[in-house]
């Protein structure tokens, strides 16, 4: 990897628990500032792959509230407006680090977690084997 | 939002830090066991939005490497597997927490921060304006 | 034309299990889509279960937990696992086929169905 010089001003770190324990603020910096706000906001509904989306909310989570993706049909939508079954909405996924309070109910002490998200889906050709 | 009993074995927190700062454990818990392990990986060549993959690295943040998706085409592939332009292949974007090392070059000092990363493109209809 | 012949139907008790397969005629590339559906008397056709080629699956509601569907893609299979089986169950199950391909990459539109395996759940 590679080697960070290391900050004299840095916080000290017990040996016992450094580099698996750190101090986290959790004072948000949104590095999103000049993203268009629309976004993705209507897409699940445009896409020829739609989805609906699921809001999946846990307390002992940080962020406690992750919207989740489920494609609404197992085909796509084609040019009449009709579900095609040559096709597949399939889910686009992504792994998302959030944390977890460890031990549990504790305000100010948490674990790394990695977590397997659906954002929103695609429409994809199946594998198809083409013989000359 | 919702309140949840401290446990009493709960490491303390200093009031002039507290909520700002907290430990995390590193030691990252993986909760994607049962996930299908061939997911989504080769749904970017396959859709009828296809994308490319780019390697963004930032060693001042955890984790330092993210993959972000940039669409192929501005419109979507068809049938014939041309692109036809009366559709839009869009990214699929979604804010994410990463940790920034603050101050800088501190191996075990971190603050949150949300980036919005595109995790896929998804083909959608273009917003047409009917006129009466 | 494709065709699909479905066996594994019959008497079984209530909480019992069946297993239903549904084959099709092999002289195509792909069906990216196999179902079941159920038709009890007097009701109209039902959807039970769905899988895509890429192994995304529906369900009714009312089946989730209970039936699993699977898939034999290369041999062109689709299977239901019926557990825990309830008198309401009991319906005459047929297999649906579409979004087939064949060998030249090319789309049949046709939506075929089985002749249909009965089912019965009763004590």
């Known amino acids: 990897g590679i080697t960070i010089p290391r900050n004299p001003g840095c916080p000290n770190s017990e040996d016992k628990n450094f580099p698996r324990t750190v101090m986290v603020n959790l004072n948000i910096h949104n590095r999103n500032t000049n993203t268009n706000p629309k976004r993705s906001s209507d897409y699940y509904n445009r896409s020829t792959s739609p989805w609906n989306l699921h809001r999946n909310e846990d307390p002992e989570r940080y962020p406690s509230v992750i919207w989740e993706a489920k494609c609404r049909h197992l085909g796509c939508i084609n040019a009449d407006g009709n579900v095609d079954y040559h096709m597949n909405s399939v889910p686009i996924q992504q792994e998302i680090l959030v944390l977890r309070r460890e031990p549990p109910h504790c305000p100010n002490s948490f674990r790394l977690e990695k977590i397997l998200v659906s954002v929103g889906c695609t429409c994809v050709t199946p594998i198809v084997h083409h013989v000359a | 939002g919702i309140t949840i009993p401290r446990n009493p074995g709960c490491p303390n927190s200093e009031d002039k830090n507290f909520p700002r700062t907290v430990m995390v454990n590193l030691n990252i818990h993986n909760r994607n066991t049962n996930t299908n392990p061939k997911r989504s990986s080769d749904y970017y060549n396959r859709s009828t939005s296809p994308w490319n993959l780019h390697r963004n690295e930032d060693p001042e943040r955890y984790p330092s490497v993210i993959w972000e998706a940039k669409c192929r085409h501005l419109g979507c592939i068809n049938a014939d597997g041309n692109v036809d332009y009366h559709m839009n292949s869009v990214p699929i974007q979604q804010e994410i927490l990463v940790l920034r090392r603050e101050p800088p070059h501190c191996p075990n000092s971190f603050r949150l921060e949300k980036i919005l990363v595109s995790v896929g493109c998804t083909c959608v209809t273009p917003i047409v304006h009917h006129v009466a | 034309e494709v065709q699909l012949v479905e066996s594994g139907g019959g008497l079984v008790q209530p909480g019992g299990s069946l297993r239903l397969s549904c084959a099709a005629s092999?002289?195509?590339?792909?069906?990216?889509?196999m179902a079941w559906y159920r038709q009890a008397p007097g009701n109209q056709r039902e959807l039970v279960a769905a899988?895509?080629?890429?192994?995304?699956?529906e369900y009714a509601d009312s089946v989730k937990g209970r039936f699993t569907i699977s898939r034999d893609i290369p041999e062109n299979t689709v299977y239901l696992q019926m557990n825990s089986l309830k008198p309401e169950d009991t319906a005459v199950y047929y297999c649906?086929?579409?979004?087939?391909?064949?060998?030249?990459?090319?789309?049949?539109?046709?939506?075929?169905w089985g002749q249909g395996t009965q089912v019965t759940v009763s004590s």
């Open positions: 649906n086929a579409k979004g087939i391909w064949d060998y030249l990459g090319r789309r049949d539109f046709g939506d075929y």
């Open positions: 092999r002289n195509i590339n792909i069906i990216n889509y």
């Open positions: 899988m895509t080629s890429d192994a995304t699956t």
